[in-house]
């Protein structure tokens, strides 16, 4: 690496992947292993995020960018850059504090994170339920009772008294 | 350079709750995890927890019930809550920039020494 | 937690001489692609603690050559080939696998 010319700032001609070395008359040296630089005139590189434990490599560091981590099969990411790992649970459960639990009587959830919801409410669009909820599926809503045939029957059941939770992070 | 300096009150009642700040400056708040550690007088390091830029937060489990951190990216800070101080938390408290979420800091604040006495 | 434990705890050096200090964690830092998530500080009197050598023997940017650090799984150690007067200070391993992360005890640096 060339000792850089500039008459300002020896440092600003140092390019992503190198650091100005202060040890070394502000030569231009690359940057040590598992970290790096990615912009120019950087006085130290930064040292490369390590996923570790629930965390898998995404992508490798670089001498120019970070790694980028994801989560282990049975985990998802959360949070901007994959910050936390949060445990997946089977569709029809939501992630407790005290682990997976099924979705109560007349909410679902139909995939592997986030909260379970309540089933829609038919009614409050004038409509009827045309397939019955699940701990997986939401309802179904079908015609309004008033366009159904004569005798046919629809029962909407009442929305839950619950609130959604929160997964914990 | 990414600079850090740490700031709150140096004199904290027992009971109480100590509260700090620190400032990043030379460098975006985001993409990194931030923590604080603290030292009390003539003694080793103590890791008390990191926030990732997006709030996702981890704890040193020998405090996690008395310790929140928090962050706020648009003044480029973040911030540490004790509560419930002893004596035994006299120390001084560095913030310092965390590359892997528990792991190598890099970057280092000067330190802020906080008294816990009446 | 996974605790650290440095030898010795005091040492006095001549300048220009070298120096070696261990640390023995109670659990392997070995990681995948032969990554041991330990790391050196040195923390000089009255200053905030600096990072030496990251990753068990990577000296992170900016530090002088004189300072190396090896070793894999339980057993670390960094060494001075000549130790300056600049040198002194608390010298601290930390692991870095786990949260947690856990320091040594601090080996305390001094010229004879």
């Known amino acids: 690496f060339e000792r850089t010319r500039s008459l300002q700032d020896p440092c600003s001609n140092c390019p992503a992947g190198t650091f100005c070395d202060n040890n070394r008359n502000q030569i231009c040296s690359p940057c040590p292993p598992n970290s790096f630089s990615s912009a120019g005139g950087q006085r130290t590189c930064d040292i490369c995020r390590q996923c570790k434990g629930v965390f898998r490599t995404r992508k490798e560091c670089s001498s120019t960018s970070n790694a980028e981590c994801d989560c282990t099969p049975g985990f998802h990411c959360l949070g901007a850059g994959c910050s936390m790992c949060e445990q997946d649970c089977k569709q029809g459960q939501e992630l407790t504090k005290k682990g997976c639990k099924d979705c109560c009587f007349g909410t679902f959830n139909d995939q592997k994170r986030g909260i379970c919801r309540p089933w829609t409410n038919c009614s409050l669009d004038g409509k009827s339920v045309l397939v019955n909820g699940t701990k997986e599926r939401d309802v179904v809503c079908g015609p309004s009772p008033a366009d159904l045939s004569p005798g046919a029957s629809s029962v909407t059941p009442p929305a839950p008294a619950r609130e959604p939770g929160h997964s914990p992070q | 350079q990414v600079q850090l300096q740490e700031s709150g009150p140096g004199l904290v009642k027992p009971s109480e709750t100590l509260s700090l700040t620190c400032t990043v400056s030379?460098?975006?708040?985001?993409?990194?995890?931030w923590s604080w550690i603290r030292q009390p007088p003539g003694k080793g390091l103590e890791w008390i927890g990191y926030?990732?830029?997006?709030?996702?937060?981890n704890y040193n489990p020998s405090l996690k019930s008395r310790v929140t951190i928090s962050v706020d990216t648009s003044k480029n800070q973040f911030s540490l809550k004790l509560s419930s101080v002893t004596a035994a938390d006299t120390a001084v408290y560095y913030c310092?920039?965390?590359?892997?979420?528990?792991?190598?800091?890099?970057?280092w604040g000067q330190g802020t020494l906080v008294t816990v006495s009446s | 937690e996974i605790v650290m434990t440095q030898s010795p705890l005091s040492l006095p050096v001549t300048p220009g001489e070298p120096a070696s200090i261990s640390c023995r964690s109670s659990?392997?830092?070995?990681?995948?692609?032969?990554?041991?998530?330990l790391d050196w500080y040195l923390q000089k009197p009255g200053q905030s603690p600096q990072l030496l050598i990251y990753?068990?023997?990577n000296r992170a940017s900016g530090v002088p050559d004189r300072f190396s650090g090896s070793g894999s799984g339980t057993d670390f150690t960094l060494k001075i080939s000549r130790v300056e007067a600049e040198d002194v200070g608390v010298y601290y391993c930390?692991?870095?696998?786990?949260?947690?992360?856990?320091f040594g005890q601090g080996t305390k640096l001094e010229i004879k």
């Open positions: 310092a920039r965390d590359q892997s979420g528990g792991g190598s800091f890099q970057h």
């Open positions: 030379g460098g975006s708040i985001s993409s990194y995890y």
């Open positions: 926030i990732y830029y997006s709030g996702s937060t």
């Open positions: 990753g068990g023997s």
């Open positions: 930390m692991q870095a696998l786990q949260t947690p992360p856990t």
């Open positions: 659990q392997s830092l070995l990681y995948s692609q032969g990554y041991n998530h």
